[in-house]
Amino acid sequence: RKIPKVGHTFFQKPESCPPVPGGSMKLDIGIINENQRVSMSRNIESRSTSPWNYTVTWDPNRYPSEVVQAQCRNLGCINAQGKEDISMNSVPIQQETLVVRRKHQGCSVSFQLEKVLVTVGCTCVTPVIHHVQ
Amino acid sequence: GITIPRNPGCPNSEDKNFPRTVMVNLNIHNRNTNTNPKRSSDYYNRSTSPWNLHRNEDPERYPSVIWEAKCRHLGCINADGNVDYHMNSVPIQQEILVLRREPPHCPNSFRLEKILVSVGCTCVTPIVHHVA
């Protein structure tokens, strides 16, 4: 899937644009808003009726190297008594993000943008039945 | 930066860390191309902490369209379909990386940008602080 070029007629390619070889693009990986942090309510992964655990995946050939994935603890949801209620289902909520992948081909190195699907947390839903045989 | 394992037979001049600027292939590698959460699942409607999805569009960014979740209620939906204010619907936020055109309007020059998105909502037990 290619990154769309600026197709809007009111956009003109500025003279200041850097020259880039065909089929590639220039990417500055010094992150804008690097220090921005999530300001979520405290411990929501434990307080949720569909609680989850976190796992850190590490890959030195990926930028950023650390990606955190959530896994729902239960199939059902936690009821008011603190028990798992299987009449409801815990389901993962997912979001795509971009990473830069570094590939070694012999002694040369190339870089590739990659979409990664991250499980962010879980929510409790009413189960559905799609098909009764 | 990130330390990268080097092929032992390669010259030592190779930088161990990711360089500040890289040339990358225009093709994005991955099969996860469905970026519209409304099409991928209906969890936003079936959740006990349902949310609405708002389209955020910016042609200077890739992806240009990002969907933002906003919880519909302060409380959660109970078994009777009513809002129960003994529980709270809260957004689940995530930092994601996007591409920002830099300099602006340039077709093939980008910088990584970290943005904070609300992806969905979850139902939690509220924290009650007792004031002495």
């Epitope: 289902n89 389901v91 839903v125 009413t126 559905v128 799609h130 098909h131 045989q133 | 079936r46």
Partner: nanobody
């Protein structure tokens, strides 16, 4: 398309036991989760036991906890529901089901009748 086939139902006295089996005809349980639900005449459908394949997480309805056990035989590609200390209120048609993704139960069997007499 996976076809789920249940067996093992029947008539049993209160306090007795039964073991229900569920096989995937024409395929495997290549799903996120598998489970059993039951439906008695005039009553709502009730999930009784569920099993997640990735980590073997099991969970039960309060009404059957301690009496029913869900298990699987990977080699035979079969899911079981061991039911003991059966009560008349356990009388229902029992169905095997699979969810190919969380929260979405796609396939159901034809069901097997369990009748518990007092």
């Amino acid at each position: 398309e996976v076809q789920l086939v249940e067996s093992g139902g029947g008539l049993v006295q209160a306090g007795g036991s039964l073991r229900l089996s569920c096989g995937a005809a024409g395929g495997t349980f290549s799903s996120y989760a598998t489970g059993w639900f039951r439906q008695a005449p005039g009553k709502e459908r009730e999930f009784v036991a569920v099993f997640r394949w990735s980590d073997s997480h099991t969970a039960y309805a309060d009404s059957v906890k301690g009496r029913f056990t869900i298990s699987r035989d990977g080699a035979k590609n079969t899911l079981y529901l061991q039911m003991s200390s059966l009560k008349p209120e356990d009388t229902a048609i029992y169905y095997c089901t699979t969810a190919t993704r969380p929260g979405e139960w796609d396939y159901w069997g034809q069901g097997t009748q369990v009748t518990v007499s007092s």
